[in-house]
Interface confidence: low
């Protein structure tokens, strides 16, 4: 008799999830010598242990603590780049500017990037059919709790000047409900972080507006200032040129406004 399975509103666990996580871990530890000591089988076991046999709407940060411990990593805390709704450009940037790091440049972020996963209560099965949607089903699902946990830790680790890349093409350039707005902003430590500098990325070719004056950016500035952290903002009018100039800063065209 086929067992009744809860139907959730979100997509199911990514195909070949265990193999993907293990393969990514092996690849990451090969590329990053400082993480060569990591035992990827133990990492997978800890990852699996966070959600297998647990109700996928009842996951806690504590469930992920064994994984967090195994994934502890030293990142220069003054080289952190946060992002919101503009992941691809942020990743392109850190691929060029190798001494800066997004969350997905760390082991734990790299393992989970773009993946979905969940289990079922009281069974060791992974649910490949459906997983809870954050809005329609529940917020304490395995994926959301994972990103909340690693994002909080990443923000807590930051120091000096922290940069955040924001999407200037969106109606809410700064969104209080994004991971950046709801988790990272509130976990920057004023005793370590001097300034949050926002880079607002323009989408349109002819867009010369000062998006740093956008009401949502003013809202971000207000939140940050109340936390005793200085705020600054820069318009990146030409993201293509911006990346090009990061690659080749000596280029004569890079002295003009980007």
């Amino acid at each position: 008799v086929p067992r009744w399975r809860q139907q959730w509103s979100g997509p199911g666990t990514t195909k070949r999830f265990p193999e993907t996580v293990l393969a990514r871990c092996v690849k990451y530890t090969e590329i990053h010598p400082e993480m060569r000591h990591v035992d990827c089988q133990s990492v997978w076991d800890a990852f699996k242990g966070a959600f297998i046999s647990k109700h996928p709407c009842n996951i806690t940060e504590e469930d992920y603590q064994p994984l967090m411990k195994l994934g502890t990593q030293t990142v220069p805390c003054n080289k952190i780049l946060l992002w919101s709704r503009i992941k691809d450009l942020a990743h392109q940037f850190t691929q060029v500017q190798r001494d800066m790091f997004t969350l997905e440049d760390t082991l734990l972020g790299y393992l989970a990037d773009d993946l979905t996963w969940c289990g079922e209560f009281n069974t060791s099965k992974i649910n490949y059919q459906s997983c809870p949607d954050w809005r329609k089903d529940c917020s304490n699902n395995p994926v959301s709790v994972f990103w909340k946990t690693v994002s909080r830790r990443f923000a807590e680790a930051a120091c000096d000047v922290v940069h955040v890349m924001l999407n200037g093409s969106r109606s809410k350039i700064f969104d209080k409900n994004s991971t950046f707005g709801s988790v990272e902003v509130h976990n920057l430590q004023p005793e370590k972080v001097q300034t949050l500098e926002a880079w607002v990325i323009h989408g349109g070719r002819e867009d010369s507006r000062d998006l740093c004056q956008d009401p949502t950016i003013k809202e971000l500035e207000s939140i940050i200032s109340k936390r005793n952290i200085q705020f600054s903002c820069k318009n990146i009018y030409r993201p293509d040129k911006f990346l090009q100039c990061v690659k080749n800063p000596e280029d004569s065209s890079c002295t003009s406004e980007i």
Epitope: T72, Q73, T74, V75, P76, C77, N78, R153, E156, A157, C159, D160, Q189, E191, K192, Q194
Partner: nanobody, 124 residues
Framework: QLQLQESGPGLVKPSETLSLTCTVS??????????WGWIRQPPGKGLEWIGS???????NYNPSLKSRVTISVDTSKNQLSLKLSSVTAADTAVYYC????????????????RGQGTLVTVSS
């Protein structure tokens, strides 16, 4: 390995200014690798961050103490100093000088490096 040593009077009168110095050895206080700060622990309570100073010279202070605190560095002596004005009995605490390492592991602040602490009692 960085070592930090606090020094200053153990007894301060109410309404006076508390002045402490921290001598750093094993590393340069002006190095961009580190940031510095002061924390304190009142008797029977938890640690409280007082403020931090960066290699650029800019400072950040605990909002509740901001109006009374000054943190500065003397690079020639490799020293960090704390001045807390208009003290009251509520400022009685063990005061620690602390250093953060930009390349240190996640979540260690404010105790990457910390002095032994010095007890300051505010009393007439």
């Amino acid at each position: 390995q960085l070592q930090l040593q606090e020094s200053g009077p153990g007894l301060v009168k109410p309404s006076e200014t508390l002045s402490l110095t921290c001598t750093v050895s094993g590393g340069s206080i002006s190095s961009s690798r580190y940031y510095w700060g002061w924390i304190r622990q009142p008797p029977g309570k938890g640690l409280e961050w007082i403020g931090s100073i960066y290699y650029s010279g800019s400072t950040n202070y605990n909002p509740s103490l901001k109006s009374r605190v000054t943190i500065s560095v003397d690079t020639s002596k490799n020293q960090l100093s704390l001045k807390l004005s208009s003290v009251t009995a509520a400022d009685t605490a063990v005061y620690y000088c602390a250093g953060g390492d930009r390349y240190g592991p996640v979540g260690q602040w404010p105790s990457d490096y910390r002095g032994q602490g010095t007890l300051v009692t505010v009393s007439s």
